[in-house]
């Protein structure tokens, strides 16, 4: 087949026609439509939105749009028995209680079904005891407490500030420290940018605002009751005691007004250094317990949430490819929100909606993409990436054979400063080339390319004249596609200036104040940043689905593999004596990386020269590119994390949001000096080097000439 048989317009005009059809005004309209009521996973409102999106995608012109439902474990507060935390006196009387809900934003006072702040999947319980302040509850914070300060958290209720790492890691760390309850709070140091008013007058977090969120440690398992398999009608479900990743101690989130009431009375040890102090007018004493006058008072948690198996609905739309219908490019983002979802997820869902509309418009004019494009509106992302994971589990055999790429589409904005991209190295060149063709929306960069403003504002730390592109971690719906299945993945959104804004995420994240007005008034009144993100996400999908040769450059993987090998080697070399004692060598890894580099270079040369009019050879070369990401998958997975199977990247064991390179080696080396059996520990390091070297070498060989 001729490469243009799929279309009645020239390839260059295709992309322009697609991008020109994207309109900021439509994104604005869709965002408004998606944010007027809450769309909590498992609720009737979110089911109705799924049906609305299904109907609209059909109208837009997709070939088919289906609902895929699953019955998964979700978590909800008890409507008649609210969750709260008390300060109790020596007689057990409650002298202070934390808030039961956030003050509703203006205009939303009469909206029903606003779920009060809660930590999803917290067990029930009413623990009482002394408080210990544990900073961000990171691994290093507990090391500081336990090893340096000799403070024992066993039997204590810990209070931790949100930020820096995924909340589930905080809870896991607290559990391992022996805590019997966890209070999470948003400190103004992390969620209140100086010089900006709090909502509704600005985009900062008010004192009554609270961040919701799940506290699971799923490690990629999906539904806690059906790990590895879809939660369908005939699923075998584990008992709750065997469920994956559930916390074992009660957890509850609060705002900074309530946190002030708890922290102002803290006694015990002073904070170890200034990095443990937030911005509240409290001493940030670590504890345990309250100071002198209040030493007989305790903290009591009242948690009554329930875990329930509930039906969720993904929307899956298909635009069939004309030439390679058995090759799938997927654009997916979630639909469920904690409350209104003004940013998370609907700023992303509105962009997906407009991308679908644009593709549909082209299709109605007679165009089709070369490859099949799948569009997904995922459910229950907020409860542990459940919708995407269950669908991928159900379709894993198809995906591992046919999946070309996955582009994620959660929140389009977390700021309005510059672009932020996390992706596989295979997509670096695609992203660079695309952003060079797009106009920058930034003030002061009129007439300049997006690439130029992005590079200026967010330069690569390694390569001058290039923008920063980060590793994929997790905490979003690309996880199953990339970390489990090895499908090349990427994500893009507009972000804040990380140099000047040190707060974590955006201040109103997962609060009731994440409204349409937040976006329209304060973040993107002209929706120009949303439009740019639509162009980046849509443009990536367009190129991946339509270019004759897949827009992957395997040489970029070679470059990062060398960088990651150097990094992990330098970490190991902090223990030169042990390396010598236990004969630890990285030679095999560096050798494999060298081989990969040479083979990738030769493959790229062949890619320039081969006969693109020969459909068999074209398909063969494209398959080598498509399957390269797959080649980094270890079927056995990482130690104790069977669903994290990518050998080059995994979510950090200390922060699900962050990506770690050579995670098997990294985890084997982590805190190795404290291991009781150094011989065994260094043996595991050697095993992980072996696994990594083998995997890199095996991946390299997939790029060799086939015969």
């Amino acid at each position: 087949k001729s490469s243009n048989e799929a279309t009645n317009i020239t390839p260059k005009h295709n992309m322009k026609a697609f991008l020109d059809e994207l309109k900021a005004e439509n994104i604005k309209k869709f965002l408004y439509n998606f944010t007027q009521i809450p769309h909590l996973a498992g609720t009737e409102q979110n089911f109705q939105l799924a049906k609305q999106i299904q109907s609209q995608w059909k109208e837009f012109g997709l070939d088919s749009v289906e609902l895929a439902h699953y019955d998964v474990l979700l978590s909800y507060p008890n409507k008649t028995h609210p969750n709260y935390i008390s300060i109790i006196n020596e007689d057990g009387n409650e002298i202070f209680n934390t808030s039961l809900f956030e003050p509703p934003p203006p205009g939303y006072e009469n909206v029903s079904d606003i779920v009060p702040p809660f930590s999803a999947f917290s067990p029930q319980g009413m623990p009482e005891g002394d408080l210990v302040y544990v900073n961000y509850a990171r691994t290093e914070d507990f090391f500081k407490l336990e090893r340096d300060m000799k403070i024992n958290c066993s039997g204590k209720i810990v209070i931790a500030r949100y930020g820096k790492v995924f909340r589930g890691n905080k809870v896991k760390n607290a559990q391992l420290a022996g805590a019997k309850g966890v209070i999470l709070y948003s400190d103004p140091a992390d969620y209140f940018a100086p010089g900006v008013k709090s909502y509704p007058d600005g985009w900062n977090l008010p004192g009554g605002g609270v961040q919701r969120g799940n506290i699971l440690n799923l490690n990629g398992a999906g539904d806690p009751l059906t790990p590895g398999y879809p939660a369908n009608e005939y699923a075998y479900r584990r008992g709750i005691a065997e469920a994956v990743g559930l916390p074992s101690i009660p957890v509850h989130p609060i705002g900074y007004y309530d946190a002030q009431k708890l922290l102002e009375k803290m006694g015990g040890s002073a904070p170890p250094d200034s990095s443990w102090r937030g911005s509240l007018k409290v001493p940030y004493n670590v504890g345990p317990g309250f100071t002198g006058n209040f030493s007989t008072q305790k903290v009591k948690m009242h948690i009554h949430s329930t875990n329930e198996v509930t039906r969720i609905y993904n929307v899956i739309g298909t635009l069939r490819g004309a030439v390679e219908p058995d090759r799938y490019v997927i654009l997916g983002g979630h639909r469920d929100s904690w409350v209104f979802g003004g940013i998370d997820p609907q700023s992303g869902a509105a962009v997906v909606h407009e991308i679908v509309r644009s593709f549909g418009t082209l299709k109605k004019e007679g165009w089709r993409p070369r490859r099949t494009i799948l569009f997904a509106s995922w459910d229950a992302e907020e409860f542990g990436l459940l919708g995407s994971t269950e669908w991928a589990e159900e379709n894993s055999r198809l995906l591992q054979e046919r999946g070309v790429a996955y582009i994620n589409a959660d929140s389009s904005i977390e700021g309005n400063y510059t672009l932020r991209v996390d992706c596989t190295p295979l997509m670096y060149s695609l992203v660079h080339n695309l952003t060079k063709e797009l106009k920058s929306p930034d003030e002061g960069f009129e007439g300049k390319s997006l690439y130029e403003s992005w590079t200026k504002k967010s330069p690569s730390p390694e390569f001058s004249g290039m923008p920063r592109i980060s590793k994929l971690g997790s905490g979003n719906d690309f996880e199953v596609f990339f970390q489990r299945l090895g499908i090349a993945s990427g994500r893009a959104r507009y972000t804040k200036n990380w140099e000047t804004n040190k707060f974590s995420g955006y201040p109103l994240y997962h609060s009731v104040y994440e409204t349409y007005e937040l976006v329209e008034k304060f973040y993107d009144p002209m929706f120009k940043y949303h439009l740019t993100v639509a162009q980046v996400r849509g443009g990536m999908v367009f190129e991946l689905a339509n270019s004759i040769v897949l827009p992957f450059d395997c040489r970029d993987y070679a470059v990062v593999l060398r960088k990651y090998a150097d990094k992990i080697y330098s970490i190991s070399m902090k223990h030169p004596q042990e390396m010598k004692t236990y004969s630890v060598s990285f030679d095999s890894l560096f050798s494999a990386v060298k081989n990969f580099t040479e083979i990738a270079s030769k493959f790229s040369e062949r890619l320039q020269d081969f006969d693109k009019s020969n459909p068999i050879v074209l398909r063969m070369m494209n398959d080598q590119l498509m399957f390269l990401e797959r080649a980094f998958i270890d079927p056995l997975g990482l130690p104790d994390r069977p669903f994290y199977r990518h050998v080059i990247y995994a979510p950090s064991s200390h922060n699900k949001y962050a990506g770690e390179s050579f995670p098997g080696i990294y985890d084997a080396l982590f805190d190795i000096e404290s291991k009781v059996d150094p011989s065994k520990a260094w043996g595991e390091v050697k095993r992980q080097i072996y696994v990594a070297a083998f995997t890199v070498q095996a991946a390299a060989e997939t790029l060799s000439e086939v015969a």
């Epitope: 709260y84 002298i95 202070f96 209680n97 934390t98 808030s99 039961l100 809900f101 956030e102 003050p103 509703p104 203006p106 006072e109 008010p206 004192g207 009554g208 605002g209 705002g255 007004y257 309530d258 002030q260 009431k261």
Partner: antibody
């Protein structure tokens, strides 16, 4: 227009009960802490009780503790004061008042909106 | 919960400045910066004049100012005017999580 209107006052015998209401309008009632303050004839102001915006915290003056209950119905934009075991010394004009700060967990930032008051007379 | 101590009355001529004191204890006025001042004309509801010791709500004349020293808070009215004649009450947050008012001060403009 931001407004508080008290109702429910009247003449009642000692030992009996009365329920006062305060209807709020013109502002986001469900985001504000609310107070009851009273003023006996010819006397000064006496703070009676406060309730947080969500009803999670209620505090009372010693003189009414155990007899009076403050409550609110945010869906009706209404504040209540249930007064039981009334005494002659409870005779006063009862005002409801709004705490100044929206969304605050405190209730000590100053009362910036007041009703016109409703008169309660306890007499045998 | 004893009432805060205020002078029963103060007076001043138009244009003069007057100060009303409000004395409490370390468990209320001295311990917190949550002192408010209210003006009440006869037969009317009170009006907030000062909050958090020294802050003026919008719409309140800058002739009204507040301060605190130790366990005593003060309200100062400068450039006294006839319409300032009213009863003035202070209030403070207390250690027992309650509020307490002062006994009130009658201001007479001579």
């Amino acid at each position: 227009e931001v407004q508080l209107v008290e109702s429910g006052g009247g003449v009642v015998q000692p030992g009996r009960s009365l329920r006062l209401s305060c209807a709020a309008s013109g502002f986001s009632f469900s985001g504000y802490g609310m107070h009851w303050v009273r003023q006996a004839p010819g006397k000064g102001l006496e703070w009676v009780a406060v309730i947080s915006y969500d009803g999670s915290n209620k505090y009372y003056a010693d003189s009414v503790k155990g007899r009076f209950t403050i409550s609110r119905d945010n869906s009706k934009n209404t504040l209540y004061l249930q007064m039981n075991s009334l005494r002659v010394e409870d005779t006063a004009v009862y005002y409801c008042a709004r705490d100044r700060i929206w969304g605050s967990r405190g209730y000590y930032y100053g009362m910036d909106v007041w009703g016109q008051g409703t008169t309660v007379t306890v007499s045998s | 919960q004893s009432a805060l101590t205020q002078p029963a009355s103060v007076s001043g001529s138009p244009g003069q400045s007057i100060t009303i004191s409000c004395t409490g204890a370390s468990s209320d006025v001295g311990g917190y910066n949550y002192v408010s001042w209210y003006q009440q004309h006869p037969g009317k509801a009170p009006k907030l004049m000062i909050y958090e010791v020294s802050n003026r709500p919008s719409g309140v004349s800058n002739r009204f100012s507040g301060s605190k020293s130790g366990n005593t808070a003060s309200l100062t009215i400068s450039g006294l005017q006839a319409e300032d004649e009213a009863d003035y009450y202070c209030s403070s947050y207390t250690i027992t999580s309650t509020l307490v008012f002062g006994g009130g001060t009658k201001l007479t403009v001579l």
